[in-house]
């Protein structure tokens, strides 16, 4: 009997009520592997979740977060509210970055400004709540005749949670 069930492909289940016949998964359910005795209920993306990929007979739905929220956890199991740049999300809500720290993302916590002097450089552009300082050449490099190219501000591309 087990051998008959192992022949049932993904998208079907082995129907015990019908002599191990492979029956298609009912609507709003799926089986991603063969030989299943039941189909799993499709995930529903409701509330702060929105559908990224519809459920099919062989794969579950995939959810994303609506605007103003971001995913956390494997398969986006949770949506957490965004903050503004220059803020961090604490357990009590969004809070402005303290002086000397910044956050250029809508998530995460505020990061200390770069200390340019540790690498023998000087501050070219001061930091803000939203942006890190920009380090320039060391003071010794700024003597007359020394060329100095202005480095770009440290932009970050939108990040992703570790999923």
């Amino acid at each position: 009997l087990q051998d008959l069930c192992s022949n049932c492909p993904a998208g079907t289940f082995c129907d015990n009520n019908r002599s191990q016949i492979c029956s298609p998964c009912p609507p709003n359910s799926f089986s991603s592997a063969g030989g299943q005795r039941t189909c799993d209920i499709c995930r529903q993306c409701k509330g702060v979740f929105k559908t990224r990929k519809e459920c099919s007979s062989t794969s579950n739905a995939e959810c994303d977060c609506i605007s103003g929220y971001h995913c956390l956890g494997a398969e986006c199991s949770m949506c957490e509210q965004d903050c503004k740049q220059g803020q961090e999300l604490t357990k009590k809500g969004c809070k402005d970055c303290c002086f000397g720290t910044f956050n250029d993302q809508k998530r995460g916590i505020c990061r200390p400004w770069t200390n340019c002097s540790l690498d023998g450089k000087s501050v070219l552009v001061n930091g803000t709540k939203e942006r890190d300082v920009v380090c320039g050449p060391s003071p010794a490099d700024l003597s007359p005749g020394a060329s100095s190219a202005t480095p770009p501000a440290p932009a970050r591309e939108p990040g992703h949670s570790p999923q």
Epitope: Q105, G108, I109, T114, L118, D119, R156, G159
Partner: antibody, heavy 120, light 110 residues
Amino acid sequence: QVQLVQSGAEVKKPGASVKVSCKASGYTFTGYYMHWVRQAPGQGLEWMGWINPNSGGTNYAQKFQGRVTMTRDTSISTAYMELSRLRSDDTAVYYCAREPGYYGTGLDYWGQGTLVTVSS
Amino acid sequence: SYVLTQPPSVSVAPGETARITCGGDDIGDKRVHWYQKKPDQAPVLVVYEDRYRPSGIPERISGSNSGNTATLTLSRVEAGDEADYYCQVWDSSSDHPGVFGGGTQLIILG
């Protein structure tokens, strides 16, 4: 897929310097901060610092300030960690690890580690 | 700088539940991350931001955090779970932002 591949093991004498490399692939190197963490034999994990590969901005643990320098070469998607004035207690496995897009979360991808042995 | 305190070891029989604690002042106000470290292997992130699992980490691994203690829970432990586990936080207010606990060796009995 994301990969961080580090340079091979090194044996150094006390007082010397070592430079460990970490080549990134499978993602946009300049978009994600890189951290360095070490583990001495029989000891725990110890955070050393980070570098923003886009700007070159760094932050070092106070313990290593003045001895560590983190740099990068964006043209070859490689981060470097140089530790100078080596002592025997710097013998450790050194890891690079990627921060996944924002500060305050866990480090999601790690290099395989580079063993640095400091011995006279 | 901020200090995280872990027990040196935790022993548990296969199939049982292991709980590894990480203590710190008002740690419940911080986001705690957990790494599994096996000999001669790189650390692996198993829980981030107190309770979230990266893809590929089994559901029997979970985390919680409140007050002065964060906890990593491994249910139905297997021989392959034997490893060192480290908690970690970021402390932007200090001169040492990245802080790890001392690590806990999970010993599977039998």
